[in-house]
C-alpha cells in the first residue's frame, strides 16, 4: 500500500519566526531613519510632508494593548505593500534629484520586499487566514516637479519609519502572547 508515512512535519517554533521578523523590521527601521536623515541633509525642507496616497498610521502606541495577532499581521502586510509600491514609484518617477539616493532606495526596496515575504511566511506558519489578493491599486501620479518628488520621498520615508516603529512594538508585544 505504499511507503509508511514519514514523521509529521514539525512547524518551526512560531516565536522563533516572530523573532526573525522583529529583527528584519528593526533593521529596516534603522535603514529608514538613516536614509531619511541623508535625504533631509541633501534637500533641506521645512515642515511636515504628506502624501494622500500613503496609508494612515495603523495604531497609536497607547492602543497596542488591544491588538490581536491576525489583525496586526494583516494590517502590517497591507501597509508595507503600500509603502513598497510607493518606494518603487519613487525610484521610477522621483526624478533626477533622487537618483543620488538610488543605491540606498534600491536596498530599502529589497529589504521591504524581504520583510513582506517574511510576514507572509509567518502568517502561514501560524495558520492565519490568508488575506485575499490585493485589488489593483490605482496608479500613482508622477510628482509635479523635482521638489514634489523630494517632498514625496520625505513623506514616504517618514510614514514608513512610523509604521515600522509601530510594527516592532506590536510584534514584541504579540510575542509575549504566543
Amino acid at each position: 500500500p505504499g511507503p509508511p508515512p514519514g514523521p509529521p512535519r514539525v512547524s518551526p517554533d512560531p516565536r522563533a519566526e516572530l523573532d526573525s521578523t522583529v529583527l528584519l523590521t528593526r533593521s529596516l527601521l534603522a535603514d529608514t531613519r538613516q536614509l531619511a536623515a541623508q535625504l533631509r541633509d541633501k534637500f533641506p525642507a521645512d515642515g511636515d510632508h504628506n502624501l494622500d496616497s500613503l496609508p494612515t498610521l495603523a495604531m497609536s502606541a497607547g492602543a497596542l494593548g488591544a491588538l490581536q495577532l491576525p489583525g496586526v499581521l494583516t494590517r502590517l502586510r497591507a501597509d508595507l505593500l503600500s509603502y513598497l509600491r510607493h518606494v518603487q514609484w519613487l525610484r521610477r518617477a522621483g526624478g533626477s534629484s533622487l537618483k543620488t539616493l538610488e543605491p540606498e532606495l534600491g536596498t530599502l526596496q529589497a529589504r521591504l520586499d524581504r520583510l513582506l515575504r517574511r510576514l507572509q511566511l509567518l502568517m502561514s506558519r501560524l495558520a492565519l487566514p490568508q488575506p485575499p489578493p490585493d485589488p489593483p491599486a490605482p496608479p500613482l501620479a508622477p510628482p509635479s516637479s523635482a521638489w514634489g518628488g523630494i517632498r514625496a520621498a520625505l513623506a514616504i520615508l517618514g510614514g514608513l519609519h512610523l509604521t515600522l516603529d509601530w510594527a516592532v512594538r506590536g510584534l514584541l508585544l504579540l510575542k509575549t502572547r504566543l
Epitope: L23, L24, R26, A30, Q34, L35, A37, Q38, R40, D41
Partner: antibody, heavy 120, light 108 residues
Framework: EVQLVESGGGLVQPGGSLRLSCAAS????????MHWVRQAPGKGLEWVAY????????YYADTVKGRFTISRDNAKNSLYLQMNSLRAEDTAVYYC?????????????WGQGTLVTVSS | EIVLTQSPATLSLSPGERATLSCSVS???????LHWYQQKPGQAPRLLIY???NRASGIPARFSGSGSGTDFTLTISSLEPEDFAVYYC?????????FGQGTKLEIK
C-alpha cells in the same frame, strides 16, 4: 590621521551655561555625522546627542533634551555643544566622536575629552 | 529604550588566560548594530569590534565578537598585559543609542 580635540570644559555653577567645542582634522568633516558622549566620574558611557553631516537631523538623549543644543560649522571643521540650565548630574568628561561611515551613526573615532564640573 | 546589561561586572584573570565578556540586550537587535569598545584609565574609549564580529582597524586577532538576537559575546583568546581595561557594548539600532554599564577586566 583622524583627530578630534575637545575644549571649553570647566567649573560652572548649577543653572549656568557652558559651550563645548570639538576641532576635527584628518578627514572630510562635512561628510560625517558627529556625536557627544559623556562619562560621569567613575561611571559608564552615556550618549548625549548626534548631528548629521548637514545638520538637518539631530537626536538628543532624554536627560539633556531642551537644555543642550548640538551644532556644527562645516567651514570651520568644528562641532559644538551648548549646555544650558546645568545640573550637578551633568558633571562628566564630554567626548566628541565621529561615526564610522556617513549616516551609520556609529562611534568610530573619539577625542580625548573635556571635563565639565557643575558645582556651587 | 534598549537596555544593555554586561556580565560579569568585574573579571579577574591572568595574562595568557581566555576572557569571555557577555552583553545581554533587553530587546532583539540585528547583529550589525552591536559594537564593543575598550577604555583604559585616563583615556578615551576606542572602537574594538563593530557589527558584532568585525575587528576595527589595528585591533589584534586575539579579540573576537559573536552573538545574535539578545546575547552577544566579546572573547579575548589569550590575555596580554595591555588588555586589562574596561569594555563596553553599545547598540546603534535605536535612538537613544545606549551602552552597557561596562565590564572591568583586571589582573588576578
Amino acid at each position: 590621521e583622524v583627530q578630534l580635540v575637545e575644549s571649553g570644559g570647566g567649573l560652572v555653577q548649577p543653572g549656568g551655561s557652558l559651550r563645548l567645542s570639538c576641532a576635527a582634522s584628518g578627514f572630510t568633516f562635512s561628510s560625517f555625522g558627529m556625536h557627544w558622549v559623556r562619562q560621569a566620574p567613575g561611571k559608564g558611557l552615556e550618549w548625549v546627542a548626534y548631528i548629521t553631516p548637514g545638520s538637518n537631523t539631530i537626536y538628543y538623549a532624554d536627560t539633556v533634551k531642551g537644555r543642550f543644543t548640538i551644532s556644527r560649522d562645516n567651514a570651520k571643521n568644528s562641532l559644538y555643544l551648548q549646555m544650558n540650565s546645568l545640573r550637578a548630574e551633568d558633571t562628566a568628561v564630554y567626548y566628541c566622536a565621529r561615526e564610522y561611515s556617513s549616516y551609520d551613526e556609529g562611534f568610530a573615532y573619539w577625542g580625548q575629552g573635556t571635563l565639565v564640573t557643575v558645582s556651587s | 529604550e534598549i537596555v544593555l546589561t554586561q556580565s560579569p561586572a568585574t573579571l579577574s584573570l591572568s595574562p595568557g588566560e581566555r576572557a569571555t565578556l557577555s552583553c545581554s540586550v533587553s530587546d532583539l537587535i540585528p547583529s550589525q548594530y552591536l559594537h564593543w569598545y575598550q577604555q583604559k584609565p585616563g583615556q578615551a574609549p576606542r572602537l574594538l569590534i563593530y557589527r558584532t564580529s568585525n575587528r576595527a582597524s589595528g585591533i589584534p586577532a586575539r579579540f573576537s565578537g559573536s552573538g545574535s538576537g539578545t546575547d552577544f559575546t566579546l572573547t579575548i583568546s589569550s590575555l596580554e598585559p595591555e588588555d586589562f581595561a574596561v569594555y563596553y557594548c553599545q547598540q546603534g539600532v535605536d535612538v537613544p543609542f545606549t551602552f552597557g554599564q561596562g565590564t572591568k577586566l583586571e589582573i588576578k
